[in-house]
């Protein structure tokens, strides 16, 4: 025989009370699948939450994080701390990054700046908190005659021969 | 046996202070966060405050925002609430609660599912 609770479909549950009728879900409640003899509490997302999706009778709630704070685990089960661009989160709370290292984003941890030596190349624009340094041309790249653009002469004072 | 017990509450007047403290037992303190949540007569739960189990990451309603600061001791196991600039309407029992956050540090709750062990609560009355 089959199970007259399986013809019931996902927002409704099998009501036990009632013959096994099918009833929708009550408010706040809600079943993603057919054949349920109780529907599920919706998730609030309350305080350090706020609701991304709200709930239906098929589907329950999702929510990410307040500003200051980002999502972290599946379905955004805890709030991480955000920190500004130039810092790392500590046991501590927000803590700058120290020299050497930077951080471009709101979370994760100061990183160390290019070492641009070790790909034989000179540092461009120095490295800040916020950014990474940028590496140019390789010292060898910049001598004259190495590079197919020719840098103008050097300008020579008047009365001086080339030595 | 887990236990987690406060105290620290009382009467005080409006614009007054006090600290709470929650200490806990019977779970390793500091892989869990930790939280503070009200409740006043006929009204329901309300999350004041929740802190990250190694502390770097804390939370704040509104309603408390710069009066109330969590904080916590993972040496002594003890959870706090320094209350400041108190109001007739902070008045409730307040209850810390306690869930279990080893694989996210840093990471925060206010969602009461969330939350392994409760406290039975300290009553907090502002008045005049």
């Known amino acids: 025989l089959q199970d007259p609770c399986s013809n019931c479909p996902a927002g409704t549950f099998c009501d036990n009370n009632r013959n096994q009728i099918c009833s929708p879900c009550p408010p706040n409640s809600f079943s993603s699948a057919g054949g349920q003899r109780t529907c599920d509490i919706c998730r609030q997302c309350k305080g350090v939450f706020r609701t991304r999706k709200e709930c239906s009778s098929t589907s329950n709630a999702e929510c990410d994080c307040t500003p200051g704070f980002h999502c972290l685990g599946a379905g955004c089960s805890m709030c991480e701390q955000d920190c500004k661009q130039g810092q790392e989160l500590t046991k501590k709370g927000c803590k700058d990054c120290c020299f050497g290292t930077f951080n471009d984003q709101k979370r994760g941890i100061c990183r160390p700046w290019t070492n641009c030596s070790l790909d034989g190349k000179s540092v461009l624009v120095n490295g800040t908190k916020e950014r990474d340094v940028v590496c140019g041309p390789s010292p060898a790249d910049l001598s004259p005659g190495a590079s197919s653009v020719t840098p103008p002469a050097p300008a020579r004072e008047p009365g001086h021969s080339p030595q | 046996e887990v236990q987690l017990v406060e105290s620290g509450g009382g009467l005080v007047q409006p614009g007054g202070s006090l600290r709470l403290s929650c200490a806990a037992s019977?779970?390793?303190?500091?892989?869990?966060?930790m939280g503070w949540v009200r409740q006043a007569p006929g009204k329901g739960r309300e999350f004041v405050s929740a802190?990250?189990?190694?502390?770097?990451?804390?939370y704040y309603a509104d309603s408390v925002k710069g009066r109330f600061t969590i904080s916590r001791d993972n040496s002594k196991n003890t959870l706090y609430l320094q209350m400041n600039s108190l109001r007739a309407e902070d008045t409730a029992v307040y209850y810390c609660?306690?869930?279990?956050?080893?694989?996210?540090?840093?990471?925060?709750?206010?969602?009461?599912?969330?939350?392994?062990?409760w406290g039975q609560g300290t009553q907090v009355t502002v008045s005049s």
């Open positions: 609660a306690a869930g279990d956050a080893y694989v996210y540090p840093y990471g925060v709750s206010t969602d009461p599912s969330f939350y392994d062990y």
């Open positions: 019977g779970f390793t303190f500091s892989s869990y966060a």
């Open positions: 802190i990250s189990g190694n502390g770097g990451s804390t």
